[in-house]
């Protein structure tokens, strides 16, 4: 889970060790602040949970790409 010690900076200290299906993902944001110990991706899931993930993992990159494409595709 992401942790906000001094709002508004949110940091991740641990990453999920399970792949999350893209069907369960709603959005993401990148954590690049120098105040955080590591770069991270925070996925927001369809059940409103936020999960920290390692941006170096392929499934994380693929999931971000998928969500980017979803955002770019206009809903009809």
């Amino acid at each position: 889970q992401p942790d906000a010690i001094n709002a508004p900076v949110t940091c991740c200290y641990n990453f999920t060790n399970r792949k999350i299906s893209v069907q369960r993902l709603a959005s993401y944001r990148r954590i690049t602040s120098s105040k955080c110990p590591k770069e991270a991706v925070i996925f927001k899931t369809i059940v409103a949970k936020e999960i920290c993930a390692d941006p170096k993992q392929k499934w994380v990159q693929d999931s971000m790409d998928h969500l980017d494409k979803q955002t770019q595709t206009p809903k009809t």
Partner: antibody, heavy 119, light 108 residues
Framework: QVELVQSGAEVKKPGSSVKVSCKAS????????ISWVRQAPGQGLEWMGA????????HYAQKFQGRVTITADESTSTAYMELSSLRSEDTAVYYC????????????WGQGTLVTVSS | DIVLTQSPATLSLSPGERATLSCRAS???????LAWYQQKPGQAPRLLIY???SRATGVPARFSGSGSGTDFTLTISSLEPEDFAVYYC?????????FGQGTKVEIK
């Protein structure tokens, strides 16, 4: 350790309703979903529906749509399954089980509640 | 709905033998969101395997899961007396989260 404790056995008349409770302890109730699964005597497992309190989602199997209602009371960490218009074929053991809404495997189960429908 | 078909319905084996149980899905179970459960008479099911191949906490190493897409397998490398039970597969990629009809592993 997570524990799910269900209400006791029930004997019901055809056409009536039954409400089974499932009280959770040892975990953050609102962070997980509760599924309901039933098992008729000598038969396999049948998924009935689920609730995810955090997201406010409820899902029902088509077979039970309109006859089953799943609710949750976060203040008491209790989930409920109400089945109406009972018939003899609804005689079964009803289980509640916890799942993580991000994934979905049922990692902790209640002990089961036997519901007997008989005139 | 995704229909799961388990085979065989019954498997008659002796302690020490290897058990191979199959679960076939009517459509692809993406990301291998498939679980295996063990159920003994009078007891609630117990989670053995999740994500097709990950062992749940406290599950002995003799249990292993494999597969992807539409074909999945649960293997018990060497049957112990306590392993004789009914085994169910379940997909949880989409609602309704359907179960297979079960495979009974009985003593030969």
């Amino acid at each position: 350790q997570v524990e799910l404790v269900q209400s006791g056995a029930e004997v019901k008349k055809p056409g009536s309703s039954v409400k089974v409770s499932c009280k959770a302890s040892g975990g953050t109730f609102s962070s997980y979903g509760i599924s309901w699964v039933r098992q008729a005597p000598g038969q396999g497992l049948e998924w009935m529906g689920a609730i995810n309190p955090l997201a406010g989602h409820t899902h029902y199997a088509q077979k039970f749509q309109g006859r089953v209602t799943i609710t949750a009371d976060e203040s008491t960490s209790t989930a409920y399954m109400e089945l109406s218009s009972l018939r003899s074929e609804d005689t079964a053991v009803y289980y509640c089980a916890r799942y993580d809404g991000i994934y979905g495997e049922l990692d902790f189960w209640g002990q089961g509640t036997l519901v007997t429908v008989s005139s | 709905d995704i229909v799961l078909t388990q085979s065989p319905a019954t498997l008659s084996l002796s302690p020490g033998e290897r058990a191979t149980l199959s679960c076939r899905a009517s459509q692809s179970v993406s990301d291998a969101y498939l679980a295996w459960y063990q159920q003994k008479p009078g007891q609630a099911p117990r989670l053995l395997i999740y994500d097709a191949s990950s062992r749940a906490t406290g599950v002995p190493a003799r249990f292993s899961g494999s597969g992807s897409g539409t074909d999945f397998t649960l293997t018990i490398s060497s049957l112990e007396p306590e392993d004789f039970a009914v085994y169910y597969c379940q997909q949880y990629i989409s609602f309704p989260a359907t179960f297979g009809q079960g495979t009974k592993v009985e003593i030969k």
